[in-house]
Amino acid sequence: HLIVTPSGCGEQNMIGMTPTVIAVHYLDETEQWEKFGLEKRQGALELIKKGYTQQLAFRQPSSAFAAFVKRAPSTWLTAYVVKVFSLAVNLIAIDSQVLCGAVKWLILEKQKPDGVFQEDAPVIHQEMIGGLRNNNEKDMALTAFVLISLQEAKDICEEQVNSLPGSITKAGDFLEANYMNLQRSYTVAIAGYALAQMGRLKGPLLNKFLTTAKDKNRWEDPGKQLYNVEATSYALLALLQLKDFDFVPPVVRWLNEQRYYGGGYGSTQATFMVFQALAQYQKDAPDHQELNLDVSLQLPSR
């Protein structure tokens, strides 16, 4: 059910492209294609290519993305395109100018001098942004989200975008300076992962991150469980980055117990993050237990 045909506007197309990209990434990383048949991988890649080609129709002259060509470009959507395309680089041919042009736009047009990334044209499909929705720590959460995307594009775009390392440092400085007084577990988790990627989740910041976990196994706020799955997935990625393998098993167990297999309305971020995190876990964790995750591969009829 994760392999779907992407379609629609610049936002809907990314909603459709997400589960296919992450499912292929997950099965590649965990070497599980034999279970489904390698021929299905080719079918899934065709769908990713289709999604990529369709997304280019929503690329603006500035290299940013929006739901429609005539709509003001969105910081969040552009960062999300960067994130998904960065992951898809190993799967299909992606023009680095498309990817790095978007990175350049984020840095030159949307980053303020204090490192914060601002959103001037929020997405229409608010359900696709996950825990960033109605977040009262928006500067921190959005900056962390964009920073993670930039770091995932770093190896691809460093040579083309000279300002990338400085932009990453500035955004990291902002997160670091404001981390200790965060209230929401979601923001602690997403900003924690962004800082961990930079090697900056240390000392008191690490204590803040670890002690925010409920029962040492989940990063949870009141409200939508989908957001808690997303937040805990970011936290798991941070723990793996930190090589904190003592803390990891209960977190993986909790994520597994949610029996969350992705798909469905409003699940874009939770789906992407849980499969990214669990793929990373199976790759990184020594002697990990096998995870029985239900990834069904029914290719859509043409």
């Epitope: 200790m180 209230q183 090697g199 240390k202 925010t212 976990a213």
Partner: antibody
């Protein structure tokens, strides 16, 4: 302004337990970590552990696991440290402290609570 | 755990003199990703709680007189009082907050002649 007010001095018997309190005011209690530090007479400082009052999550120095238990009551903006199975080694001044700036150094401290373990 | 070693354990100085105290860590406190040393210096006057003087090895806490100067990087750190005053009579502790558990030096006691 930020203040941490600790409970008064305690004289307790060996083998018993004690609970030290730290009442916070002047800031959003649930947003900031509370650290606990031990200082024995004429000696240095030892980090016991930390509590996140918002989640109740804790992290301890291995040395104090089983000795100290940290809790927090959001309704009264108070953090607590429970010390069990007391011996003369536990006689010390105990401080609570918090980070309010982004220096990562503990910039606000309670006045300290003296615990004396004696028969 | 990171071990913090302070020296000297005590020193007596006259008002106006320059004071230097040392703190060494058993491993580097420099985070290469932000070029910051995770070290603080505290002053504890008799019967009081500790007070931050310097953080990130060399940044003076606001309100702290500029005669207090923190320096050093990696494993070797120094706190200098450029011209000691009578009110500086206190114990001085260094603390690393690079890794958990946080650890303190055993302190330097400053006495005024």
């Amino acid at each position: 302004q930020v203040q941490l007010q600790q409970s008064g001095a305690e004289l307790v018997r060996p083998g018993t337990s004690v609970k030290v309190s730290c009442k916070a005011s002047g800031y959003a209690f649930t947003n900031y970590l509370i650290e606990w530090i031990k200082q024995r007479p004429g000696q240095g400082l030892e980090w016991i552990g930390v509590i996140n009052p918002g989640s109740g999550g804790t992290n301890y120095n291995e040395k104090f696991k089983g000795k100290a238990t940290l809790t927090a009551d959001k309704s009264s903006n108070t953090a607590y440290m429970h010390l069990s199975s007391l011996t003369s080694e536990d006689s010390a001044v105990y401080f609570c402290a918090t980070y309010y700036s982004n220096s990562f150094a503990m910039d606000y401290w309670g006045q300290g609570t003296s615990v004396t373990v004696s028969s | 755990d990171i071990v913090m070693t302070q020296s000297p354990s005590s020193l007596a100085m006259s008002v106006g003199q320059k004071v230097t105290m040392s703190c060494k860590s058993s491993q580097s406190l420099l985070n290469s990703s932000n070029q910051k040393n995770y070290l603080a210096w505290y002053q504890q006057k008799p019967g009081q709680c500790p007070k931050v003087l310097v953080y990130f090895a060399s940044t003076r806490e606001s309100g702290v007189p500029d005669r207090f100067i923190g320096s050093g990087s990696g494993t070797d750190f120094t706190l200098t009082i450029s011209s000691v005053q009578a009110e500086d009579l206190a114990d001085y502790f260094c603390q690393q907050y690079y890794s958990i558990p946080f650890t303190f030096g055993s302190g330097t006691k400053l006495e005024i002649k």
